[in-house]
Amino acid sequence: IVGGTNSSWGEWPWQVSLQVKLTAQRHLCGGSLIGHQWVLTAAHCFDGLPLQDVWRIYSGILNLSDITKDTPFSQIKEIIIHQNYKVSEGNHDIALIKLQAPLNYTEFQKPICLPSKGDTSTIYTNCWVTGWGFSKEKGEIQNILQKVNIPLVTNEECQKAYADAKIAQAMVCAGYKEGGKDACKGDSGGPLVCKHNGMWRLVGITSWGEGCARREQPGVYTKVAEYMDWILEKTQSSDGKAQMQSPA
């Protein structure tokens, strides 16, 4: 996160760290807890690393430097990448992770509510992006979970900023015209959440941007509302019954 500040314990209890253990262990992506056994993240996090057993998912964590060999983590039972995601395109950048064992909810580890299907009418004015990613383009992973308040921008505005790309309906953009605040490398897959009527909702999944926090280059996020049917279908067919946090 560029231009952010330290988060507090329990402030973003749905935020998880997706880490890979090969020879060493490192944080690669963020994710959002959306049910006892489900994490929502970006499909591109698994490019070149589709093997379930190399991944460790840490929840209820604020400071990555607190993680030791004794820190509990979740393992992956199943990775469900959106069927239309292609490495060559970058559209449909969304994936579900089914955990091997369900998590108990605590003050520091609980799910984020999902938006209503096809939610286009809600005007979100209080949106935040969180993650342990770089604090500048040529930076490094941060220890303490960072947060930054970023306004949504229209897809039309976003398309002007990215003339050589296609900003699809299933994407949502956020950023300041002057730059300075944004997600960055290592924040991929993490949440863009907005508070509306006193409730936090998962509006976007951190996907891509041209550099980080550059002027007139907003961050691009997968628009979760456009994938509600897919999320429900995959979690229900795998679970028998869904355990999602949908809005009341």
Partner: antibody, heavy 125, light 108 residues
Framework: EVQLLESGGGLVQPGGSLRLSCAAS????????MTWVRQAPGKGLEWVSY????????IYADSVKGRFTISRDNSKNTLYLQMNSLRAEDTAVYYC??????????????????WGQGTLVTVSS | EIVLTQSPGTLSLSPGERATLSCRTS???????LAWYQQKPGQAPRLLIY???SRATGIPDRFSGSGSGTDFTLTISRLEPEDFAVYYC?????????FGQGTKVEIK
């Protein structure tokens, strides 16, 4: 199977014009940025131009700017290169290529993942 | 314009040997925008490596890419007879997109 098939090359006099076409199949053409790359006989590869998926955004190499125009017809899955005021130094094999733009570490990736077989353009009097 | 300089110009090696090809860029290039291509006589180029280190579909694991910033490397761990060709690095970080001048890997 992704296929790109160029056509329209041939012999043309200096100052003349030619229009190259590239017929695409096996993928959703309208989702991809497309590019032209050329290779003079016995020389290396030179990027010429690219066009955005919608066709609304184009960029050219300085060597062809103002003389060449890239365009596309997404309804026909076809990419074009209109070449005017041709010079001897434009003699080359012209390749069309698909530009893959995925995502890695929250940044786009960009690379030419499929190429046509090329069409030879010879500019000579 | 970002200039890509490949070295050596020609590499004379025997099958089974290791080939190390260098590509230096005149300005910083985000590694996501650095690719390597192989070209054989009379054929179109073929994508080998994208994002500086990711192998393209169907490319054997004897090909590997590495590097960041301004210094990138293509390594062929054990040359097979079909690997003798010209190799190009290419950047699409900034327009104009540019290629290196190529390294020819020939049989010694």
């Amino acid at each position: 199977e992704v296929q790109l098939l160029e056509s329209g090359g041939g012999l043309v006099q200096p100052g003349g014009s030619l229009r190259l076409s590239c017929a695409a199949s096996g993928f959703t053409f309208s989702h991809y940025l497309m590019t032209w790359v050329r290779q003079a006989p016995g020389k290396g590869l030179e990027w010429v131009s690219y066009i955005s998926p919608s066709g609304g955004h184009t960029i050219y190499a300085d060597s062809v700017k103002g003389r060449f125009t890239i365009s596309r017809d997404n309804s026909k899955n076809t990419l074009y290169l209109q070449m005017n005021s041709l010079r001897a130094e434009d003699t080359a094999v012209y390749y069309c290529a698909r530009v893959a733009r995925g995502i890695a570490a929250r940044s786009r990736t960009s690379y030419f993942d499929y190429w046509g077989q090329g069409t030879l353009v010879t500019v000579s009097s | 314009e970002i200039v890509l300089t490949q070295s050596p110009g020609t590499l004379s090696l025997s099958p089974g040997e290791r080939a190390t090809l260098s590509c230096r860029t005149s300005q910083f290039v985000n590694s996501n925008y650095l690719a390597w291509y192989q070209q054989k006589p009379g054929q179109a180029p073929r994508l080998l490596i994208y994002g500086a280190s990711s192998r393209a579909t169907g490319i054997p694991d004897r090909f590997s890419g590495s590097g960041s910033g301004t210094d990138f490397t293509l390594t062929i761990s054990r040359l097979e007879p079909e690997d003798f060709a010209v190799y190009y690095c290419q950047q699409s970080s900034r327009t104009p997109w540019t290629f290196g001048q190529g390294t020819k890997v020939e049989i010694k």
